[in-house]
Protein backbone atom coordinates (compact mmCIF):
# COMPACT_ATOMS: atom_id res chain seq x y z
CA UNK A 1 0.00 0.00 0.00
CA UNK A 2 1.30 3.46 -0.92
CA UNK A 3 1.30 5.60 2.20
CA UNK A 4 3.55 8.46 1.12
CA UNK A 5 2.62 12.01 0.27
CA UNK A 6 4.38 14.56 -1.89
CA UNK A 7 4.77 18.03 -0.52
CA UNK A 8 5.50 20.68 -3.15
CA UNK A 9 6.00 24.42 -3.34
CA UNK A 10 2.47 24.57 -4.76
CA UNK A 11 1.49 27.57 -6.86
CA UNK A 12 4.45 29.88 -7.29
CA UNK A 13 5.19 33.01 -9.26
CA UNK A 14 8.45 34.55 -10.37
CA UNK A 15 9.70 37.44 -12.43
CA UNK A 16 10.59 37.19 -16.09
CA UNK A 17 14.37 36.89 -16.39
CA UNK A 18 14.68 35.57 -12.86
CA UNK A 19 15.07 32.05 -11.54
CA UNK A 20 12.99 29.67 -9.46
CA UNK A 21 13.63 26.50 -7.48
CA UNK A 22 11.22 23.65 -8.16
CA UNK A 23 11.15 21.47 -5.08
CA UNK A 24 9.18 18.43 -3.93
CA UNK A 25 9.52 16.34 -0.81
CA UNK A 26 8.27 12.80 -0.24
CA UNK A 27 7.17 12.00 3.30
CA UNK A 28 5.18 9.43 5.31
CA UNK A 29 6.81 6.44 3.65
CA UNK A 30 9.88 4.32 4.26
CA UNK A 31 10.17 3.59 0.52
CA UNK A 32 13.56 4.21 -1.06
CA UNK A 33 13.67 6.99 -3.65
CA UNK A 34 15.53 5.60 -6.65
CA UNK A 35 14.91 8.40 -9.13
CA UNK A 36 13.09 11.71 -9.55
CA UNK A 37 11.86 12.85 -12.97
CA UNK A 38 10.95 16.48 -13.63
CA UNK A 39 8.46 17.11 -16.43
CA UNK A 40 6.66 20.05 -17.97
CA UNK A 41 3.42 19.05 -19.72
CA UNK A 42 4.64 16.83 -22.56
CA UNK A 43 8.40 17.09 -22.19
CA UNK A 44 11.09 15.97 -19.82
CA UNK A 45 13.20 18.60 -18.07
CA UNK A 46 15.53 16.43 -16.05
CA UNK A 47 16.08 13.15 -14.25
CA UNK A 48 17.99 12.67 -11.03
CA UNK A 49 18.94 9.03 -10.49
CA UNK A 50 20.51 8.16 -7.16
CA UNK A 51 23.19 6.03 -8.84
CA UNK A 52 23.44 7.22 -12.44
CA UNK A 53 23.51 10.96 -11.71
CA UNK A 54 21.64 13.72 -13.54
CA UNK A 55 20.18 13.90 -17.03
CA UNK A 56 19.22 17.36 -18.28
CA UNK A 57 17.17 17.49 -21.49
CA UNK A 58 19.00 19.33 -24.26
CA UNK A 59 16.24 21.89 -24.72
CA UNK A 60 16.78 23.00 -21.11
CA UNK A 61 20.54 22.49 -20.76
CA UNK A 62 21.40 26.19 -20.90
CA UNK A 63 19.00 27.26 -18.17
CA UNK A 64 18.32 24.34 -15.86
CA UNK A 65 20.67 23.59 -12.99
CA UNK A 66 20.51 20.40 -10.91
CA UNK A 67 19.49 20.84 -7.30
CA UNK A 68 19.34 21.77 -4.61
CA UNK A 69 19.04 18.11 -3.62
CA UNK A 70 16.48 16.39 -5.80
CA UNK A 71 15.04 19.75 -6.85
CA UNK A 72 15.63 21.75 -9.98
CA UNK A 73 16.60 25.37 -10.56
CA UNK A 74 15.02 26.99 -13.63
CA UNK A 75 16.85 30.12 -14.77
CA UNK A 76 16.33 32.96 -17.26
CA UNK A 77 12.57 32.59 -16.97
CA UNK A 78 10.30 33.62 -19.82
CA UNK A 79 6.53 34.01 -19.94
CA UNK A 80 6.46 30.76 -21.94
CA UNK A 81 7.67 28.93 -18.82
CA UNK A 82 4.28 29.55 -17.20
CA UNK A 83 2.49 26.26 -16.64
CA UNK A 84 2.41 22.99 -14.77
CA UNK A 85 5.52 21.14 -13.63
CA UNK A 86 5.53 17.62 -12.25
CA UNK A 87 7.96 15.82 -9.99
CA UNK A 88 7.67 12.06 -10.38
CA UNK A 89 9.27 10.10 -7.57
CA UNK A 90 10.24 6.54 -8.48
CA UNK A 91 10.41 4.55 -5.26
CA UNK A 92 10.97 1.00 -4.11
CA UNK A 93 8.82 -0.81 -3.22
CA UNK A 94 5.92 1.68 -3.40
CA UNK A 95 6.11 2.68 -7.07
CA UNK A 96 5.65 6.23 -8.33
CA UNK A 97 4.39 9.34 -6.58
CA UNK A 98 3.60 12.52 -8.53
CA UNK A 99 3.59 16.10 -7.30
CA UNK A 100 2.38 19.17 -9.19
CA UNK A 101 3.69 22.73 -9.16
CA UNK A 102 2.09 25.58 -11.06
CA UNK A 103 4.51 28.33 -12.06
CA UNK A 104 3.40 31.73 -13.25
CA UNK A 105 6.06 33.95 -14.77
CA UNK A 106 5.14 37.60 -14.39
CA UNK A 107 6.22 40.62 -16.40
CA UNK A 108 6.00 42.84 -13.32
CA UNK A 109 8.14 42.79 -10.20
CA UNK A 110 5.21 41.67 -8.05
CA UNK A 111 5.88 37.93 -7.74
CA UNK A 112 4.86 36.21 -4.55
CA UNK A 113 5.29 32.61 -3.51
CA UNK A 114 2.11 30.63 -2.93
CA UNK A 115 1.45 28.47 0.07
CA UNK A 116 2.81 24.94 0.34
CA UNK A 117 0.29 22.18 -0.16
CA UNK A 118 0.17 18.40 -0.23
CA UNK A 119 -0.87 15.87 -2.84
CA UNK A 120 -1.60 12.35 -1.54
Amino acid sequence: MMTGTIETTGNISAEKGGSIILQCHLSSTTAQVTQVNWEQQDQLLAICNADLGWHISPSFKDRVAPGPGLGLTLQSLTVNDTGEYFCIYHTYPDGTYTGRIFLEVLESSVAEHGARFQIP
Epitope: T34, Q35, N37, E39, D42, Q43, L44, I47, N49, A50, D51, L52, G53, W54, H55, I56, S57, P58, S59, K61, P66, H90
Partner: antibody
Protein backbone atom coordinates in the same frame (compact mmCIF):
# COMPACT_ATOMS: atom_id res chain seq x y z
CA UNK B 1 39.61 11.15 -28.91
CA UNK B 2 37.34 9.11 -26.69
CA UNK B 3 38.05 5.38 -26.79
CA UNK B 4 36.64 2.41 -24.88
CA UNK B 5 38.75 -0.73 -25.30
CA UNK B 6 37.38 -4.00 -23.99
CA UNK B 7 39.09 -7.24 -23.02
CA UNK B 8 39.14 -10.20 -25.37
CA UNK B 9 36.69 -13.02 -26.07
CA UNK B 10 36.02 -15.60 -23.36
CA UNK B 11 34.76 -19.17 -23.35
CA UNK B 12 33.26 -20.33 -20.05
CA UNK B 13 31.56 -23.40 -18.62
CA UNK B 14 28.03 -23.20 -17.20
CA UNK B 15 28.13 -22.15 -13.54
CA UNK B 16 31.39 -20.23 -13.93
CA UNK B 17 31.90 -16.45 -13.78
CA UNK B 18 33.31 -14.01 -16.29
CA UNK B 19 34.81 -10.57 -15.75
CA UNK B 20 35.03 -8.19 -18.71
CA UNK B 21 37.07 -4.99 -18.57
CA UNK B 22 36.63 -1.68 -20.37
CA UNK B 23 39.57 0.73 -20.48
CA UNK B 24 38.60 4.34 -21.13
CA UNK B 25 40.79 7.06 -22.60
CA UNK B 26 40.43 10.50 -24.17
CA UNK B 27 38.22 12.00 -21.45
CA UNK B 28 38.03 12.39 -17.67
CA UNK B 29 36.90 8.93 -16.56
CA UNK B 30 35.12 10.06 -13.39
CA UNK B 31 32.84 12.54 -15.20
CA UNK B 32 30.75 10.07 -17.18
CA UNK B 33 28.59 7.13 -16.17
CA UNK B 34 29.62 3.80 -17.69
CA UNK B 35 27.04 1.23 -18.73
CA UNK B 36 27.07 -2.40 -19.76
CA UNK B 37 24.78 -3.62 -22.53
CA UNK B 38 24.66 -7.11 -23.96
CA UNK B 39 23.33 -8.62 -27.17
CA UNK B 40 22.63 -12.33 -27.55
CA UNK B 41 22.82 -13.70 -31.11
CA UNK B 42 19.97 -12.26 -33.18
CA UNK B 43 18.45 -10.57 -30.13
CA UNK B 44 17.73 -7.00 -29.04
CA UNK B 45 20.15 -4.99 -26.95
CA UNK B 46 19.76 -5.44 -23.18
CA UNK B 47 20.89 -2.92 -20.56
CA UNK B 48 22.64 -4.67 -17.67
CA UNK B 49 23.44 -1.69 -15.49
CA UNK B 50 25.60 1.36 -15.03
CA UNK B 51 28.13 2.80 -12.61
CA UNK B 52 28.95 6.37 -11.67
CA UNK B 53 32.77 6.22 -11.63
CA UNK B 54 33.01 9.31 -9.43
CA UNK B 55 31.31 7.93 -6.32
CA UNK B 56 30.98 4.29 -7.34
CA UNK B 57 27.18 4.13 -7.09
CA UNK B 58 25.71 1.60 -9.49
CA UNK B 59 22.27 0.59 -10.71
CA UNK B 60 21.76 -2.93 -12.08
CA UNK B 61 18.96 -4.53 -14.07
CA UNK B 62 17.06 -6.66 -11.54
CA UNK B 63 16.50 -9.26 -14.26
CA UNK B 64 19.96 -10.55 -13.42
CA UNK B 65 18.99 -11.14 -9.76
CA UNK B 66 22.34 -10.21 -8.26
CA UNK B 67 24.44 -12.10 -10.82
CA UNK B 68 25.88 -8.84 -12.19
CA UNK B 69 28.58 -6.84 -10.40
CA UNK B 70 29.77 -3.60 -11.96
CA UNK B 71 32.91 -2.00 -10.52
CA UNK B 72 35.54 0.49 -11.53
CA UNK B 73 39.19 1.34 -10.90
CA UNK B 74 39.50 5.10 -11.25
CA UNK B 75 43.31 5.01 -11.14
CA UNK B 76 43.29 2.76 -14.22
CA UNK B 77 40.28 4.47 -15.89
CA UNK B 78 38.74 1.04 -16.22
CA UNK B 79 35.25 -0.33 -15.62
CA UNK B 80 34.48 -3.99 -15.03
CA UNK B 81 31.41 -6.18 -15.39
CA UNK B 82 31.34 -9.56 -13.70
CA UNK B 83 28.56 -12.03 -14.45
CA UNK B 84 28.30 -15.11 -12.25
CA UNK B 85 26.44 -18.44 -12.42
CA UNK B 86 26.73 -18.42 -16.19
CA UNK B 87 24.26 -20.35 -18.33
CA UNK B 88 24.09 -20.99 -22.06
CA UNK B 89 21.63 -18.10 -22.58
CA UNK B 90 24.33 -15.70 -21.32
CA UNK B 91 26.22 -16.30 -24.58
CA UNK B 92 26.32 -12.82 -26.05
CA UNK B 93 28.42 -9.86 -27.06
CA UNK B 94 28.94 -7.60 -24.06
CA UNK B 95 29.47 -3.88 -24.64
CA UNK B 96 30.54 -1.10 -22.35
CA UNK B 97 29.13 2.30 -23.26
CA UNK B 98 29.63 5.76 -21.85
CA UNK B 99 26.78 8.18 -21.31
CA UNK B 100 27.30 11.91 -21.77
CA UNK B 101 27.87 14.55 -19.13
CA UNK B 102 24.43 15.14 -17.53
CA UNK B 103 22.98 13.21 -20.44
CA UNK B 104 21.85 9.57 -20.41
CA UNK B 105 22.34 8.94 -24.14
CA UNK B 106 25.17 6.44 -24.63
CA UNK B 107 27.49 8.29 -26.99
CA UNK B 108 30.61 6.08 -27.09
CA UNK B 109 30.72 2.29 -27.13
CA UNK B 110 33.43 -0.32 -26.74
CA UNK B 111 34.11 -2.78 -29.54
CA UNK B 112 32.30 -5.60 -27.73
CA UNK B 113 33.46 -8.78 -26.03
CA UNK B 114 32.05 -12.14 -27.08
CA UNK B 115 31.36 -14.42 -24.12
CA UNK B 116 30.50 -17.99 -25.04
CA UNK B 117 29.03 -20.28 -22.40
CA UNK B 118 29.29 -23.92 -23.37
CA UNK B 119 29.86 -27.22 -21.66
CA UNK C 1 9.68 -2.81 -16.84
CA UNK C 2 8.78 -0.57 -19.76
CA UNK C 3 8.43 -2.45 -23.06
CA UNK C 4 9.52 -0.77 -26.28
CA UNK C 5 7.94 -2.16 -29.44
CA UNK C 6 9.20 -1.19 -32.89
CA UNK C 7 7.45 -1.52 -36.21
CA UNK C 8 8.09 -2.83 -38.67
CA UNK C 9 10.62 -5.46 -37.55
CA UNK C 10 12.17 -5.29 -40.99
CA UNK C 11 11.65 -3.42 -44.22
CA UNK C 12 13.03 -3.39 -47.73
CA UNK C 13 13.69 -0.05 -49.37
CA UNK C 14 15.62 1.51 -52.22
CA UNK C 15 18.24 4.24 -52.18
CA UNK C 16 16.43 7.58 -52.15
CA UNK C 17 13.32 6.23 -50.39
CA UNK C 18 11.81 7.90 -47.35
CA UNK C 19 11.78 5.45 -44.44
CA UNK C 20 9.79 5.74 -41.22
CA UNK C 21 10.29 3.53 -38.17
CA UNK C 22 7.97 3.75 -35.19
CA UNK C 23 8.55 2.88 -31.56
CA UNK C 24 5.80 2.50 -28.97
CA UNK C 25 6.41 2.47 -25.23
CA UNK C 26 4.18 0.38 -22.96
CA UNK C 27 3.82 3.39 -20.66
CA UNK C 28 4.61 7.09 -20.58
CA UNK C 29 8.30 7.88 -21.12
CA UNK C 30 7.95 11.62 -21.81
CA UNK C 31 10.80 12.53 -24.20
CA UNK C 32 13.38 10.14 -22.73
CA UNK C 33 13.99 8.20 -25.94
CA UNK C 34 17.15 7.57 -27.95
CA UNK C 35 17.76 5.94 -31.35
CA UNK C 36 20.82 3.88 -32.29
CA UNK C 37 22.09 2.44 -35.56
CA UNK C 38 23.89 -0.89 -35.61
CA UNK C 39 25.67 -2.63 -38.47
CA UNK C 40 26.52 -6.37 -38.40
CA UNK C 41 29.45 -7.18 -36.13
CA UNK C 42 29.73 -3.59 -34.91
CA UNK C 43 28.77 -1.70 -31.78
CA UNK C 44 25.67 0.52 -31.90
CA UNK C 45 26.09 4.19 -32.78
CA UNK C 46 24.09 7.02 -31.25
CA UNK C 47 21.87 8.71 -33.85
CA UNK C 48 19.08 10.72 -32.21
CA UNK C 49 18.35 11.63 -28.60
CA UNK C 50 15.70 13.38 -26.53
CA UNK C 51 14.07 12.35 -29.06
CA UNK C 52 14.59 14.91 -31.84
CA UNK C 53 18.22 15.98 -31.44
CA UNK C 54 20.73 14.67 -33.94
CA UNK C 55 23.99 13.52 -32.42
CA UNK C 56 27.21 15.17 -33.59
CA UNK C 57 28.08 14.18 -37.16
CA UNK C 58 24.75 12.51 -37.91
CA UNK C 59 23.45 13.58 -41.35
CA UNK C 60 20.39 15.84 -41.52
CA UNK C 61 18.40 13.16 -43.39
CA UNK C 62 17.88 11.50 -39.99
CA UNK C 63 15.18 13.01 -37.80
CA UNK C 64 13.23 11.94 -34.74
CA UNK C 65 10.02 13.01 -33.08
CA UNK C 66 7.51 11.98 -30.45
CA UNK C 67 6.51 12.30 -26.82
CA UNK C 68 4.70 10.20 -24.27
CA UNK C 69 4.43 6.72 -25.76
CA UNK C 70 4.81 7.16 -29.53
CA UNK C 71 8.08 7.92 -31.29
CA UNK C 72 9.28 8.02 -34.89
CA UNK C 73 12.64 7.84 -36.64
CA UNK C 74 12.61 9.10 -40.22
CA UNK C 75 15.28 8.82 -42.91
CA UNK C 76 14.25 11.32 -45.56
CA UNK C 77 16.32 9.90 -48.41
CA UNK C 78 17.89 6.52 -47.78
CA UNK C 79 21.60 6.21 -48.64
CA UNK C 80 23.63 3.02 -49.20
CA UNK C 81 25.36 3.42 -45.82
CA UNK C 82 21.99 3.55 -44.01
CA UNK C 83 21.24 -0.14 -44.47
CA UNK C 84 21.46 -1.34 -40.87
CA UNK C 85 19.38 -2.21 -37.82
CA UNK C 86 17.85 0.63 -35.81
CA UNK C 87 16.95 0.44 -32.12
CA UNK C 88 14.94 2.77 -29.92
CA UNK C 89 15.69 2.90 -26.19
CA UNK C 90 14.02 4.55 -23.20
CA UNK C 91 15.87 6.00 -20.21
CA UNK C 92 12.77 7.30 -18.44
CA UNK C 93 13.13 4.67 -15.72
CA UNK C 94 15.44 1.80 -14.91
CA UNK C 95 15.93 -0.78 -16.19
CA UNK C 96 16.57 1.02 -19.45
CA UNK C 97 15.00 -0.98 -22.27
CA UNK C 98 15.41 -1.27 -26.04
CA UNK C 99 13.06 -2.04 -28.87
CA UNK C 100 13.53 -5.31 -30.73
CA UNK C 101 15.13 -3.50 -33.66
CA UNK C 102 14.12 -2.66 -37.22
CA UNK C 103 16.32 -4.08 -39.96
CA UNK C 104 16.47 -1.87 -43.05
CA UNK C 105 17.43 -3.97 -46.07
CA UNK C 106 18.08 -3.23 -49.73
CA UNK C 107 15.11 -3.88 -52.01
Amino acid sequence: QVQLVQSGAEVKKPGASVKVSCKASGYTFTENTMHWVRQAPGQRLEWMGGINPNQGGNRNNQKFKGRVTITRDTSASTAYMELSSLRSEDTAVYYCARSGLRDYAMDYWGQGTLVTVSS
Amino acid sequence: DIQMTQSPSSLSASVGDRVTITCKASQHVSTAVVWYQQKPGKAPKLLIYSPSYRYTGVPSRFSGSGSGTDFTLTISSLQPEDFATYYCQQHYSTPWTFGQGTKVEIK
